[in-house]
């Protein structure tokens, strides 16, 4: 028969033959022959490979690396690798999170958006009219004006992005 | 580990019949074809026949062939090679070797066969 | 098929020295689908290359194979007083039948 130009799904064509590749966990160790089929070995503790393959070395585990501020989300397995994220109050500066930073925190005249994640910053935006926020914070958002009104007293100075308004006791000379 | 161990050897008469065994262990057998290749005294290696993992497919040297047949048990882990209408000239010992693109890696011990009256 | 000559079919050397084992063969070895064997007496054949130049595992490094095509060369840089033996080439690609060389013994001088 007329050697093969292309083979199936799950296999690789070498020196005019079609040989299975290797599952997900297992690495290469011989090609197959007309006689034997692929050879292939499970990959090592802290190893993986996570694709049908035919490659003869399995890939290193990633290490969340403590000094960079990483710890493990999830173990790697023989199929997948190690999920890394950041300690409590750091994100990833990256999609392939090797390497934290500290969250940033809102300075005042601005709050907090969105809470900072192991993988995603602190979302500031600015306080609108009538909101306020005086401290820098990670995780405070924009506080709305006191209402005097409500306590029975008038506004004795205007509030602005970063200050509360000053409420006062009613002038009682005023009829 | 990888071992192959033969056996079924010994004297026999020309015209006679023998049936040796190879018995594998340490991998899986079921996944790897299987040769048998043998050595005359004093002589070089001699390629004899190679059997298919399944045991689908069967080829033979021609100084073999129609006399001797090739074949496996995969539930016993066991090459076999029936020897019949046994000359002279088979007199050798028998190694069984496993089949991988990297050539024949591993060998049995070997076992003797004479043929003699 | 394919017939494979060895030359020398002798080779006398002393330990330390370098040895070179030719293996030519008939016509073109396919995919160089070539290897050589190490048989000491009383025992069986052991893998040394495969593919012509890759060593087999835990095959010393003073082990080296070359060529391709029609012509291959096994060199021992030093021989070791372990490796005199008898070696054999083998051709794994074009079957029925899978050939070997006649064999070169290295020999202590």
């Known amino acids: 028969p007329e050697p093969p130009t292309a083979c199936r799904e799950k296999q690789y064509l070498i020196n005019s033959q079609c040989c299975s590749l290797c599952q997900p966990g297992q690495k290469l160790v011989s090609d197959c022959t007309e006689f034997t089929e692929t050879e292939c070995l499970p990959c090592g503790e802290s190893e993986f490979l996570d694709t049908w393959n035919r490659e003869t070395h399995c890939h290193q585990h990633k290490y969340c690396d403590p000094n960079l501020g990483l710890r493990v989300q999830q173990k790697g397995t023989s199929e997948t690798d190690t999920i890394c994220t950041c300690e409590e109050g750091w994100h990833c500066t990256s999609e392939a999170c090797e390497s934290c930073v500290l969250h940033r925190s809102c300075s005042p005249g601005f709050g907090v958006k969105q809470i900072a994640t192991g993988v995603s910053d602190t979302i500031c935006e600015p306080c609108p009219v009538g909101f306020f926020s005086n401290v820098s914070s990670a995780f405070e958002k924009c506080h709305p004006w006191t209402s005097c009104e409500t306590k029975d007293l008038v506004v004795q100075q205007a509030g602005t992005n970063k200050t509360d308004v000053v409420c006062g006791p009613q002038d009682r000379l005023r009829a | 580990q990888v071992q192959l161990v033969e056996s079924g050897g010994g004297v026999v008469q020309p015209g006679r019949s023998l049936r040796l065994s190879c018995a594998a262990s340490?991998?899986?057998?079921?996944?790897?074809?299987m040769h048998w290749v043998r050595q005359a005294p004093g002589k070089g290696l001699e390629w004899v026949a190679v059997?298919?993992?399944?045991?689908?497919?069967?080829y033979y040297a021609d100084s073999v062939k129609g006399r001797f047949t090739i074949s496996r048990d995969n539930s016993k882990n066991t090459l076999y090679l029936q020897m019949n209408s046994l000359r002279a000239e088979d007199t050798a010992v028998y190694y069984c070797?496993?089949?991988?693109?990297?050539?024949?890696?591993?060998w049995g011990q070997g076992t003797m066969v004479t043929v003699s009256s | 098929e394919i017939v494979l000559t060895q030359s020398p079919g002798t080779l006398s050397l002393s330990p330390g020295e370098r040895a070179t084992l030719s293996c030519r063969a008939s016509?073109?070895?396919?995919?160089?689908?070539l290897a050589w064997y190490q048989q000491k007496p009383g025992q069986a054949p052991r893998l040394l290359i495969y593919?012509?130049?890759t060593r087999a595992n835990g095959i010393p490094d003073r082990f080296s194979g070359s060529g391709s095509g029609t012509d291959f060369t096994l060199t021992i840089s030093r021989l070791e007083p372990e490796d005199f033996a008898v070696y054999y080439c083998?051709?794994?690609?074009?079957?029925?039948?899978?050939?070997f060389g006649g064999g070169t013994k290295v020999e202590i001088k």
């Open positions: 070797a496993r089949d991988t693109s990297r050539g024949h890696d591993i």
């Open positions: 340490g991998f899986t057998f079921e996944k790897y074809g």
């Open positions: 059997i298919h993992y399944e045991g689908s497919i069967k």
């Open positions: 593919g012509a130049s």
């Open positions: 083998g051709e794994y690609a074009d079957y029925p039948p899978f050939t």
């Open positions: 016509q073109s070895v396919s995919y160089d689908y």
